[in-house]
């Protein structure tokens, strides 16, 4: 349902759903320029907006555009549809809440009087309400029963900060110290699971926060307990260092699993595998890229692009890679739809030079690059070796890989195998005599 999509998108982008809308029902053949012009004509007179993304929706076989508004949705002026190519396009917004209007009017009135929502809450006996949230544009808390027993949400002891980077910045804690404080404070908080989770996320930065966001995107009802378990699994010391690396090396896509879904599943395992290893961000990115190339069946176009990045030594970071893969998946969806529409005619992107190049490169012979292990420069033999890695970085940074050196290792190349075929080989297995197999020496990058 479009509304669910809007809500999910807002959650994923940490956006106020009252400042967002979705335009659905955009014909597949609509170009970006046509979309931009139509949206501009329909929305520009109302308020400033930003287009944050486009996607293909299978259920209505059309494109959708996600838009952030400069102001909260004005239900009186916002059209339910805008005229566009192929008919009218539906404008999806969060349903109007009758209380919102009252609260926003009350807010303006109080501002004129030099008062705030906090004063109202005190007058009503809601002394437990969080000061900072009371003066927001709309305060859902005010709707709760006015005479609840005081909660600890007004003033609460904030958690220390944990980022999951190998060398914590000033003001950040080690995982053990952070976890100790969380375990101590959590039981004291007499608040809802949602609020607990919000406070937990508030204390996270960098890779730790990225991982939580990924987990939340996959399961928005994830509990605080589950969040902590995931963090313990990744950053805790319980599992043997090598075991986590082996687990990462063993991970292959499931039958029919999309590349983007596999990447989401792989990321926490990669972060755990590289945690505490003296490696650069760029090396983590290189490992991720090489693992995908070795293990995943993908379209020649995507493989061509990823191999180009690999050859150039410019591995994308997690978010960049995800964007690239999702773009490609969307493109494939679009292409499939167009093919269904017009059947044998037309040369899709399949005939392009880019794809031809990509196809040529899939079967290209493997280049063997010498790599060093973590602590030792002598190469050793292992099946399915990975490049070594150094300190990890924020996954959400706006910068792309910014030039640290990275070690490399040979990765067996995954031919464009049919979905469901296990990677080229599981780590430690014999390579069969199929195409692409061959005896090869891999450095042992994980060895310490």
């Amino acid at each position: 349902m479009a509304l669910t999509l809007l809500e999910d998108w807002c959650k994923g982008m940490d956006m106020d759903p009252r400042k967002a809308l979705l335009i659905v029902g955009i014909p597949m053949e609509c170009s970006e320029v046509e979309i931009q012009d139509t949206v501009k004509a329909g929305l520009q007179p109302l308020c400033a907006y930003r287009v944050l993304g486009r996607m293909f929706r299978r259920e209505d076989n059309a494109k959708a555009v996600f838009i952030e508004l400069a102001d909260t949705v004005n239900y009186t002026t916002l059209p339910s549809h805008i005229p566009g190519k192929g008919g009218s396009w539906e404008v999806v917004v969060k349903p109007r809440n009758p209380d919102d209007e009252f609260l926003s009017r009350l807010n303006y009135f109080l501002k004129d009087e030099g008062r705030s929502m906090t004063d109202v809450a005190r007058a009503l006996g809601c002394c437990s309400l969080p000061a900072e949230s009371l003066d927001a544009e709309v305060m859902p808390q005010v709707r709760s029963p006015p005479l609840e027993p005081p909660k600890e949400s007004m003033w609460y002891r904030k958690l220390k900060v944990f980022s999951g980077t190998a060398s914590p910045s000033p003001g950040e804690e080690t995982f053990e110290d952070w976890l100790e404080q969380v375990t101590e404070i959590m039981p004291i908080w007499q608040v809802s699971e949602v609020e607990k989770r919000r406070r937990l996320l508030e204390s996270l930065r960098g890779p730790a926060l990225s991982i939580m966001r990924v987990l939340q995107a996959n399961n928005d009802s994830i509990t605080v307990e589950q969040c902590l378990d995931a963090l313990k699994q990744i950053f805790g010391d319980k599992e043997d260092f090598r075991a986590s690396q082996f687990r990462f090396l063993q991970t292959s896509p499931k039958i029919g699993e999309k590349v983007s879904t596999f990447l989401l599943r792989l990321e926490p395992l990669l972060q755990k595998a590289v945690h505490k290893s003296p490696l650069s961000v760029r090396s983590t990115d290189m490992i991720r890229l090489k693992h995908l190339l070795a293990r995943v069946a993908m379209t020649p176009a995507l493989r061509g692009k990823l191999e180009l990045l690999d050859q150039r030594g410019c591995p994308p970071n997690f978010l960049e890679l995800m964007k690239l893969i999702r773009d490609e998946e969307e493109w494939e969806n679009t292409e499939a739809v167009m093919k269904n529409k017009e059947k044998p005619s037309g040369r899709g992107r399949g005939a392009s030079g880019r794809q031809a190049r990509a196809e040529a490169s899939v079967s290209a012979p493997q280049a063997t690059v010498q790599a060093r292990s973590f602590s030792d420069s002598s190469p050793q033999t292992i099946q399915g070796g990975l490049p070594p890695l150094v300190k990890r970085r924020r996954l959400l940074g706006s910068e792309s890989t910014r030039g640290e050196d990275h070690g490399q290792a040979t990765y067996p190349k995954a031919e464009n195998q049919t979905p469901g075929r296990e990677g080229p080989q599981a780590a430690g297995e014999e390579l069969g005599n199929e195409a692409g197999a061959g005896a090869m020496s891999h450095p042992k990058p994980w060895e310490t």
Partner: antibody, heavy 121, light 108 residues
Framework: QVQLQESGPGLVKPSETLSLTCTVS????????WSWIRQPPGKGLEWIGY???????NYNPSLKSRVTISVDTSKNQFSLKLRSVTAADTAVYYC???????????????WGQGTLVTVSS | DIQMTQSPSTLSASVGDRVTITCRAS??????LAWYQQTPGKAPKLLIY???SLESGVPSRFSGSGSGTEFTLTISSLQPDDFATYYC??????????FGQGTKVEIK
């Protein structure tokens, strides 16, 4: 480190077409959007337009009728063509990496050093 | 199009001064604003995005604030490297990306 380098003639005759190329190194052109921005001598900045690796473009309406931006992913390059130039198009032309669609904003985080193009007969 | 107006056009200050530059948008743009610094003969350099987020590697003496139509860039203690021209840029999709006309910070 991502680096951008503009190249092309520094002198163009009025009514002709200005052509510039931007070469991206240290990163793939296939992930971000890429923009052209210009700055007439002693004046402010003007955004010309952007392109994505797929070929999607968006141009400033004030220049739309005269501008074409194209991309060559195999060379990690994108190009600008501005037709029917006049002296008013004399400017330093910059190429830049564009974060269009990023939740944090559509800004320019890496720039080329710029190339001065003079329109004169 | 959304117009961006910066003030002042020129500002004379000394090393160590606290400097504030204002940028006003012709319509509400939430926090969709970036600030750049440009020194003569060089390309602009991103300082701030989303009105108040500091770009990595930019000294913490630079800060941005504001939302809606009024925005400010503040340099808490002016350093010799900071004498330059500063531009604001809005990024609403409802208008082409537009820049302010610039504010030149010069030595008093």
């Amino acid at each position: 480190q991502v680096q951008l380098q503009e190249s092309g003639p520094g002198l163009v005759k009025p009514s002709e077409t200005l052509s510039l190329t931007c070469t991206v190194s240290g990163g793939s052109i296939s992930i971000y959007y890429w923009s052209w921005i210009r700055q007439p001598p002693g004046k402010g900045l003007e955004w010309i337009g952007y392109i994505y690796y797929s070929g999607s473009t968006n141009y400033n309406p004030s220049l739309k009728s005269r501008v074409t931006i194209s991309v060559d992913t195999s060379k990690n390059q994108f190009s600008l063509k501005l037709r029917s130039v006049t002296a008013a198009d004399t400017a330093v032309y910059y190429c830049a990496r564009d974060t269009y669609g990023d939740p944090r904003g559509d800004y320019f985080d890496y720039w080329g050093q710029g190339t001065l193009v003079t329109v004169s007969s | 199009d959304i117009q961006m107006t910066q003030s002042p056009s020129t500002l004379s200050a000394s090393v160590g001064d606290r400097v504030t530059i204002t940028c006003r948008a012709s319509q509400r743009i939430s926090n969709w604003l970036a600030w750049y610094q440009q020194t003569p003969g060089k390309a602009p350099k991103l300082l701030i995005y989303k009105a108040s987020s500091l770009e990595s590697g930019v000294p913490s003496r630079f800060s941005g604030s504001g939302s809606g139509t009024e925005f400010t860039l503040t340099i808490s203690s002016l350093q010799p490297d900071d004498f330059a021209t500063y531009y604001c840029q809005q990024y609403s999709s409802s208008s082409p990306r537009t820049f302010g006309q610039g504010t030149k910070v010069e030595i008093k």
